[in-house]
Interface confidence: low
């Protein structure tokens, strides 16, 4: 192959680093360089050197080389948030390159504490009992303590506290939530005992009181969310589904959800009601299938919700966003590292999807023409390309046994994105493949019939 300078990619964890670890690791991938002579160095934004680096041997692939370097930074430094990125610098005979590698944000955030009280008819059994639910949300780091007080004295029994869970978020620092329930007797509640949920976090105490004498009249807090169809769902199911989510319903028997077109014409809507949630509310979902061309045309669709608690119907309107730049993804398939195969345990194949817009992308792995179980691979959420505003990158990691890999089995990464000429592209790799084979194909219907 002809001599060429490397292309650099930032390597960041698809999970935000947990705030109770001592280090944060980020990396830099240099690809497609020749000759095999490369030097990595790392610098902070202010140009000072970073010493705690680790290099990995280069790998020959398709007549060109690839190599990675990792840097380990103390969490407390990252936590201060002074550097939103570090710089990966590479020296190569065919040209020097550098790339900004974003750092995860590790924040210290206080909990928001809420107590949910039972409705008047929410006591059951003999003696009649119900639950108070305390929820602490949005906090970081994860260490937290929840306790209950009755008239200022610690409650010893009837308390169940769940394990701390990370909250689902698309961006920003990882935050956590925890739920604790206290079983109470109706006689204590109606006797106007004061119950307190106490939350201790990072040396601070947060308290929320609950008593039957201060339960406000239920406000109409019904909320409506109109959810557009995702490209992945259009691609997989060949149907364009509009979803209208209605939350915080006090009763489910009088809710109606309907979708209408821009011209007022009704679209057939199928409604599903949830089970009762822990805070004694219900939610409902209204789904309507429309023509993909109608959605792509930019036509507006309106969800209308009626309920006995609402003085007038609630409406939400959505349409496909206009003027979103379309950029097709570049797809790179990286075979397992030789060092990993030498361990004779497992083989990790990485599908790197870069430079696409909008962020909606679908990745599927296949073996012998059949889709692999989603349990066998992990796909990251799309993340903004640090050096290309408005574009995104993602990666999917497939883990197979070393034996499977060494039999010469082929593995295919299929990427679907609306900017691709046929909406789909694939890359295939096996033990004998030096580079990767590319195919842009239509007609994958049979693959997603499972």
């Amino acid at each position: 192959g002809s001599a060429s300078a490397p292309t650099l990619f930032p390597l960041v964890s698809c999970e935000n680093s947990p705030s109770d670890t001592s280090s944060v690791a980020v990396g830099c991938l240099a690809q497609d360089f020749l000759p095999d002579s490369i030097t990595f160095s790392w610098k902070y934004k202010n140009n000072s050197d970073i010493s705690s680096t680790r290099g990995f041997p280069s790998v020959l692939r398709g007549g060109k080389y690839a190599a990675t370097s990792q840097v380990l930074l103390p969490s407390k430094d990252v936590m201060q948030g002074t550097d939103e990125h570090v710089v990966c610098k590479v020296q190569h005979p065919n040209g020097n390159k550098e790339k900004n590698v974003p750092l995860p944000v590790i924040a210290e955030l206080p909990p928001k504490v809420s107590v949910f009280v039972p409705p008047r008819d929410g006591f059951f059994g003999n003696p009649r009992k119900s639950k108070l639910i305390c929820q602490a949300t949005g906090f970081s780091p994860r260490q937290i303590q929840v306790s209950w007080l009755r008239e200022g004295k610690q409650v010893g029994s009837g308390v169940t506290t769940d394990q701390v869970q990370a909250e689902a978020k698309e961006s920003g620092p990882t935050t956590y939530k925890v739920t604790s329930t206290l079983t109470i007797k109706e006689s204590d509640w109606l006797g106007q005992s004061m119950f307190t949920c106490r939350v201790d976090h990072r040396g601070l105490t947060f308290q929320q009181n609950a008593s039957s004498m201060c339960v406000p009249d239920q406000d109409t807090a019904i909320r409506v969310f109109a959810i557009p169809p995702s490209f992945a769902s259009i691609f997989l199911t060949k149907s364009t589904k509009l979803t209208c989510l209605v939350t915080d319903l006090t009763t489910y028997d009088s809710v109606t959800i309907s979708w209408t077109r821009q011209n007022g014409e009704a679209v057939k809507t199928h409604t599903n009601i949830s089970e009762s949630h822990p805070n004694a509310t219900f939610s409902a979902v209204g789904e309507a299938s429309i023509c993909e061309d109608d959605w792509n045309s930019g036509e507006r669709f309106t969800c209308t919700v009626t309920h006995t608690d609402l003085p007038s119907p609630l409406k939400q309107t959505i349409s496909r966003p206009k003027g979103v730049a379309l950029h097709r993804p570049d797809v790179y398939l990286l075979p397992p590292a030789r060092e990993q195969l030498n361990l004779r345990e497992s083989a990790t194949i990485t599908c790197l999807v870069t430079g696409f817009s909008p962020a909606d992308v679908f990745v599927q792995w296949m073996q012998r023409g059949q889709p692999l179980s989603p349990e066998k691979y992990v796909t990251s959420a799309p993340m903004p390309e640090p050096q290309a505003p408005g574009r995104y990158f993602a990666h999917s990691i497939l883990t197979v046994s070393e034996e499977e890999w060494n039999t010469g089995e082929t593995y295919t990464c299929v990427v679907a994105h609306e900017a691709l000429p046929n909406r789909v592209t694939e890359r295939t790799v096996d033990k004998s493949t030096e580079g990767e084979v590319s195919a842009d194909e239509e007609g994958f219907e049979n693959l997603w019939a499972t």
């Epitope: 999970e15 670890t21 990370a166 349990e375």
Partner: nanobody, 118 residues
Framework: CVQLLESGGGLVQFGGSLRLSCAAS????????MGWYHQAPGKERELVAI???????EYAASVKGRFTISRDYAKNTVYLQMNSLQPEDTAVYYC????????????WGQGTQVTVSC
């Protein structure tokens, strides 16, 4: 769902050693952090040690230098080597792991008793 199977607990003399192990099975491909918590009688469950998917380990101050956490990624197993054990280390030790994207879900083992006698 992820199932966690712990082993290695028991009775040990002051200053002795034990090695706990915990194997994850089920839908274990997307496990990120794995670790150990302990709960002494009448106390809250507390973090002992945790190891991330990137291999970074974190320890509670009380066990630093005495306990070592390690992980076999291929076998989805986490180990806790406990040296210089003290009576205050007596507790039920729970294996813990987190799985899933984008929502992290915590899973817990049944617990294994460690008792340190004087």
């Amino acid at each position: 769902c992820v199932q966690l199977l712990e082993s290695g607990g028991g009775l040990v003399q002051f200053g002795g050693s034990l090695r706990l192990s915990c194997a994850a099975s089920g839908n274990s491909f997307s496990i990120s952090n794995m670790g150990w918590y302990h709960q002494a009688p009448g106390k809250e469950r507390e973090l002992v040690a945790i190891i991330t998917s990137g291999g970074v380990a974190e320890y509670a101050a009380s066990v630093k230098g005495r306990f070592t956490i390690s992980r076999d990624y291929a076998k989805n197993t986490v180990y806790l080597q406990m040296n210089s054990l003290q009576p205050e280390d007596t507790a039920v030790y729970y294996c813990h792991c987190e799985s899933g994207f984008p929502t992290l879900i915590a899973y817990w083992g049944q617990g294994t008793q460690v008792t340190v006698s004087c």
